[in-house]
């Protein structure tokens, strides 16, 4: 299994939207992609989960564009706030 986030950093103005890309490789039929936000304290905050056989996930300002065949799960954060400045991680799990 493998997860790749090619964007090392992104800068966007407040109130705009940003899309963070995540590509993965897996031989599992059933799996989940999780998006987390890392606080300055290094604490990881769960944001949203995308199931491999679920509709495109959406939760508040967070939405996922799931391309199952291409194994791509992009996180979009809308109406950006200053507090959104952080490091974001995607993770693959069964």
């Amino acid at each position: 299994q493998k997860v790749t986030q090619a964007q090392s950093s992104v800068s966007m103005p407040v109130r705009k939207a940003v899309t963070l890309n995540c590509l993965y490789e897996t031989s599992w039929w059933s799996y989940y992609i999780f998006w987390y936000k890392q606080l300055p304290s290094k604490e990881m905050i769960f944001l949203i989960r995308q199931g491999s056989d679920e509709q495109n996930a959406k939760s508040g300002r967070y939405s996922v564009n799931f391309k199952k065949a291409a194994k791509s799960v992009a996180l979009t954060i809308s109406a950006l706030q200053l507090e959104d400045s952080a490091k974001y991680f995607c993770a693959l799990g069964e």
């Epitope: 590509l23 039929w29 056989d53 509709q55 391309k67 199952k68 065949a69 791509s72």
Partner: antibody, heavy 117, light 106 residues
């Protein structure tokens, strides 16, 4: 509104290749995968494969690996499917369909391919 | 690959009748989607996520099921419902479709 316009019917000789096109409009082309589906009276609907126009990443049904090759041109919002070494078994209607997660909400009108000597 | 088996292959009904067609999966799936196809036309997205009606689909259609057994029911069949209905899954690595149920109106 979302529209998928496919190329016209093709009559091709056995052993030859053919390239079908699917031009998308009404949405941001790189945001969605494009899939291809084959339909015949014998085998019904069969998923051939898909391409992510944003990255060019492709995925194929094992059955069609080596038979079909998918490409995308972002500048013209068009996806192409090349079918190689055609036989009578490849005679079918081929559809492009835009993905949305695990769904196929939008379909082209189909392209009839007839393989005959 | 997950195989989807639809039954019956052909269903004949009179206007106003209630009809049910089934879709059985060779392994458990999370969701089933349904398409309606009329001769000479491309498949139309009909029901998604097992039970959600696509835009413009009449309320007389309902979808249900879980695991390996799913169904599409039309409460009161109308002449315009004559078509072939296909189920589809994508819980496995590759999407697969059922063989279809052809609905004929007497």
């Amino acid at each position: 509104q979302v529209q998928l316009q496919q190329s016209g019917a093709e009559l091709v000789r056995p052993g030859a290749s053919v390239t079908l096109s699917c031009k998308a409009s009404g949405y941001r082309f790189p945001d969605y995968e494009m899939h291809w589906v084959k339909q015949t009276p014998v085998h019904g609907l069969e998923w051939i494969g898909a391409i992510d126009p944003e990255t060019g990443r492709t995925a194929y049904n094992q059955k069609f690996r080596g038979k079909a090759k998918l490409t995308a041109d972002k500048s013209s919002s068009t996806v192409y499917m090349e079918l190689r070494s055609l036989t009578s078994e490849d005679s079918a209607v081929y559809y492009c369909t835009r993905g949305y997660g695990i769904q196929f909400p939008y379909w082209g009108q189909g392209t009839l391919v007839t393989v005959s000597a | 690959q997950i195989v989807l088996s639809q039954s019956p292959a052909i269903l004949s009904a009179s206007p106003g009748e209630k009809v049910t067609m089934t879709c059985r999966a060779s392994s458990s799936v999370s969701y089933i989607h349904w398409f309606q196809q009329k001769p000479g036309s491309s498949p139309k997205f009909w029901i998604y996520g097992t039970s959600n009606l696509a835009s413009g689909v009449p309320a007389r259609f309902t979808g249900s099921g879980s695991g390996t057994s799913y169904s599409l029911t039309i409460s009161r069949v109308e002449a315009e419902d004559a078509a072939t209905y296909y189920c589809q899954q994508w819980s496995s690595d590759s999407p697969t479709f059922g063989g279809g149920t052809k609905l004929e109106i007497k």
